[in-house]
């Protein structure tokens, strides 16, 4: 058993049928010695008396808010949550496996640049009685500071019969140098509580590996005289690290017909312009990627050919 | 990347061209190592990230772009020098700061070259003959060092009398390649910045 926060405790249980559970001793936070009784949640049934209460915690029915009273007055509370260990592996019931980029990916994180700011998000099908708290650091043995905001519900989607909820959080490394070579990964830890179930999820990454630039901005077409060709030009996104000559991007320019089946023409360039043939009803799209470290491509920025 | 990209005229800034070749070569070598050593801990998540140049060179700090010298987090490790206008060409006057940056890059390359050559000698003794260093990568390191055109004492190749532990050697190779790839990215950024200056 360990304390998650004031008056909230997590009991770790080896979870299997007929498991013996864990013996827990609760102590009433009071100078009083006599006349103390204990109840669980809203029930008025007295579970025991005295300054301490010993309970055997086996199932969720044994978890909840234990309260000690004296003469009708509440003295203190202890909320017991359960953390299930199933065959040596902590349960992952609360969050959905996003399966990207690999199986057992519960937290996904992205950064738009090398400033030390990043966003993480996760999915769940649970809509109520759900709380998250996020902590982060650079390295784990001698952790350096990363400040995270509160997790917020960022999207709701309908997936078949189920509703899916996306939560996200923004974090900022306290002292980040965009040019630094990372040797210690960022660690992100999410505590999730659903009703009386506690779970924790972690992700470890280097900012360089989660970079995904914003799409190029100001995408424009300039027709070339007496030709089907057009000059496509664009600019680095505002959110990208500067100076651009140091933090360079490379670009992929794509000409795509109306039908998804039509052949796509693609050109790769380090410049911020390219000459392509514009077909009728086609659209031109450009995306960006760090020129020197191949992390994710940005989303496409698009303009119609017409 | 799927398609090759046109590089600037090498005569204009030869170091840029060589640094791009270096990054390509080390990335290919790392990919090959990860595939060949699939039963060894060779991924970024599994290895310890060690920097053999730590406390010996200061490439990141010495080559910091002028724009980032205002960022206190980039200056916290030492009195940092930063690069100003200049190029890799001997015919142009390079500033003291830039010379410091380029000599730091040269020292990095020299240290990695010695490590890789020592490691290759060990890998050649492996009866499994599982993996060797790409000669192209070693050649590209050499070419960039020549283009940087610094003279420094030659570091003797380390020789070891004890029987090599091939498992440890292969893990060390992965660690070295990961670190060298990161340094090659920094070198490429620096050369690109200098080229634009």
């Amino acid at each position: 058993i360990w304390e998650l926060k004031k008056d909230v405790y997590v009991v770790e249980l080896d979870w299997y049928p007929d498991a013996p559970g864990e013996m827990v001793v609760l102590t009433c936070d009071t100078p009083e010695e006599d006349g103390i009784t204990w109840t669980l949640d809203q029930s008025s049934e007295v579970l025991g008396s005295g300054k301490t209460l010993t309970i055997q915690v086996k199932e969720f029915g044994d978890a909840g808010q234990y309260t000690c009273h004296k003469g009708g007055e509440v003295l203190s509370h202890s909320l017991l949550l359960l953390h299930k260990k199933e065959d040596g592996i902590w349960s992952t019931d609360i969050l959905k496996d996003q399966k990207e980029p690999k199986n057992k990916t519960f937290l996904r994180c992205e950064a738009k640049n090398y400033s030390g700011r990043f966003t993480c998000w996760w999915l769940t099908t649970i809509s109520t009685d759900l709380t998250f708290s996020v902590k982060s650091s650079r390295g784990s043995s001698d952790p350096q500071g990363v400040t995270c905001g509160a997790a917020t519900l960022s999207a709701e989607r309908v997936r078949g019969d189920n509703k899916e909820y996306e939560y996200s959080v923004e974090c900022q490394e306290d002292s980040a140098c965009p040019a630094a070579e990372e040797s210690l990964p960022i660690e992100v830890m999410v505590d999730a509580v659903h009703k009386l179930k506690y779970e924790n999820y972690t992700s470890s990454f280097f900012i360089r590996d989660i970079i995904k630039p914003d799409p190029p901005k100001n995408l424009q077409l300039k027709p070339l005289k007496n030709s089907r060709q057009v000059e496509v030009s664009w600019e680095y996104p505002d959110t990208w690290s500067t100076p651009h000559s140091y933090f360079s991007l490379t670009f992929c320019v794509q000409v795509q017909g109306k039908s998804k089946r039509e052949k796509k023409d693609r050109v790769f360039t380090d410049k911020t312009s390219a000459t392509v043939i514009c077909r009728k009803n086609a659209s031109i799209s450009v995306r960006a990627q760090d020129r020197y470290y191949s992390s994710s491509w940005s989303e496409w920025a698009s303009v119609p050919c017409s | 990347r799927n398609l090759p990209v046109a590089t600037p005229d090498p005569g204009m800034f030869p170091c840029l061209h060589h640094s791009q070749n270096l990054l390509r070569a080390v990335s290919n070598m790392l990919q090959k190592a990860r595939q060949t050593l699939e039963f060894y801990p060779c991924t970024s998540e599994e290895i310890d990230h060690e920097d053999i140049t730590k406390d010996k060179t200061s490439t990141v700090e010495a080559c910091l772009p002028l724009e980032l010298t205002k960022n206190e987090s980039c200056l916290n490790s030492r009195e940092t020098s930063f690069i100003t206008n200049g190029s890799c060409l001997a015919s142009r006057k390079t500033s003291f700061m830039m010379a410091l940056c380029l000599s730091s890059i040269y020292e990095d390359l020299k240290m990695y070259q010695v490590e890789f050559k020592t490691m290759n000698a060990k890998l050649l003794m492996d009866p499994k003959r599982q993996i060797f260093l790409d000669q192209n990568m070693l050649a590209v390191i050499d070419e960039l060092m020549q283009a940087l055109n610094f003279n420094s004492e030659t570091v003797p190749q380390k020789s070891s009398l004890e029987e090599p532990d091939f498992y440890k050697t292969k893990i060390k190779l992965c660690i070295l390649l990961h670190a060298f790839r990161i340094r090659a990215v920094t070198i490429d950024r620096v050369m690109s910045y200098l080229n634009a200056s």
Epitope: Y16, D18, D87, N103 | -
Partner: antibody, heavy 115, light 112 residues
Framework: QVQLVQSGGGVVQPGRSLRLSCAAS????????MHWVRQAPGKGLEWVAF????????YYADSVKGRFTISRDNSKNTLYLQMKSLRAEDTAVYYC????????WGQGTMVTVSS | SYVLTQPPSVSGTPGQRVTISCSGG????????VKWYQQLPGTAPKLLIY???QRPSGVPDRFSGSKSGTSASLAITGVQAEDEADYYC????????????FGTGTKVTVLG
């Protein structure tokens, strides 16, 4: 004490269907994940499928994906394995099993796929 | 498609020490616990060892488990005639959990 009693095995022709049941008693069935494991005659153990305690997630071996469906009825304390498009290579003793560091197995039920 | 490899058979005379190996990889045994089962002819498997080296109550202490790196082993010190059975190791793969990974199985024969 924990008990898992299996039923539903038998002889079936290739291409036909069969449904196995596993009735649980002696524990809170709705709190635990469950597996199906099979063993072809003279061969080793092969995992078939898993279902979470609340039925929200199901996992299958590649060899049965798209043909077998694991399900549970927590109000009846029963686990099921619906087997469709059966093949000769599905011939085996099928076991249900609880998920956890200490597990409990059913007695096994024989499924024979033969024409 | 067994990822955990066991010797097909091992044998020993009563009182001898018998060991069975179970070889896997970094993503299974290397990062998860190992279990061992005993299966007597015509019966369901019985749990002998969980959590690499833990014995459930009721399992004789002549059975012991251990794990090192990407391999695990089961030792029977002072093998007895009633130990003649098939033995299976089991673990998980970190990418496919909760799918159970079973070993190929080992037939233990008690001679004499």
């Amino acid at each position: 004490q924990v008990q898992l009693v299996q039923s539903g095995g038998g002889v079936v022709q290739p291409g036909r269907s069969l449904r196995l049941s596993c009735a649980a008693s002696g524990f809170t069935f709705s709190s635990y994940g469950m597996h199906w494991v099979r063993q072809a005659p003279g061969k080793g153990l092969e995992w078939v499928a898993f279902i979470r305690y609340d039925g929200s997630n199901k996992y299958y071996a590649d060899s049965v994906k798209g043909r077998f469906t694991i399900s549970r009825d927590n109000s009846k304390n029963t686990l099921y394995l619906q087997m469709k498009s059966l093949r000769a290579e599905d011939t085996a003793v099928y076991y249900c099993k609880t998920h956890g560091s200490h597990d409990n197995w059913g007695q096994g039920t024989m499924v024979t796929v033969s024409s | 498609s067994y990822v955990l490899t066991q010797p097909p058979s091992v044998s020993g005379t009563p009182g001898q020490r018998v060991t069975i190996s179970c070889s896997g990889g970094r993503s299974n045994i290397g990062s998860n616990y190992v279990k061992w089962y005993q299966q007597l002819p015509g019966t369901a498997p019985k749990l002998l060892i969980y959590g690499n080296d833990q014995r459930p109550s009721g399992v004789p202490d002549r059975f012991s488990g251990s794990k090192s790196g990407t391999s695990a082993s089961l030792a029977i010190t002072g093998v007895q005639a009633e130990d003649e059975a098939d033995y299976y190791c089991q673990s998980y793969d970190r990418g496919t959990h909760p799918a159970l990974l079973f070993g190929t199985g080992t037939k233990v024969t008690v001679l004499g």
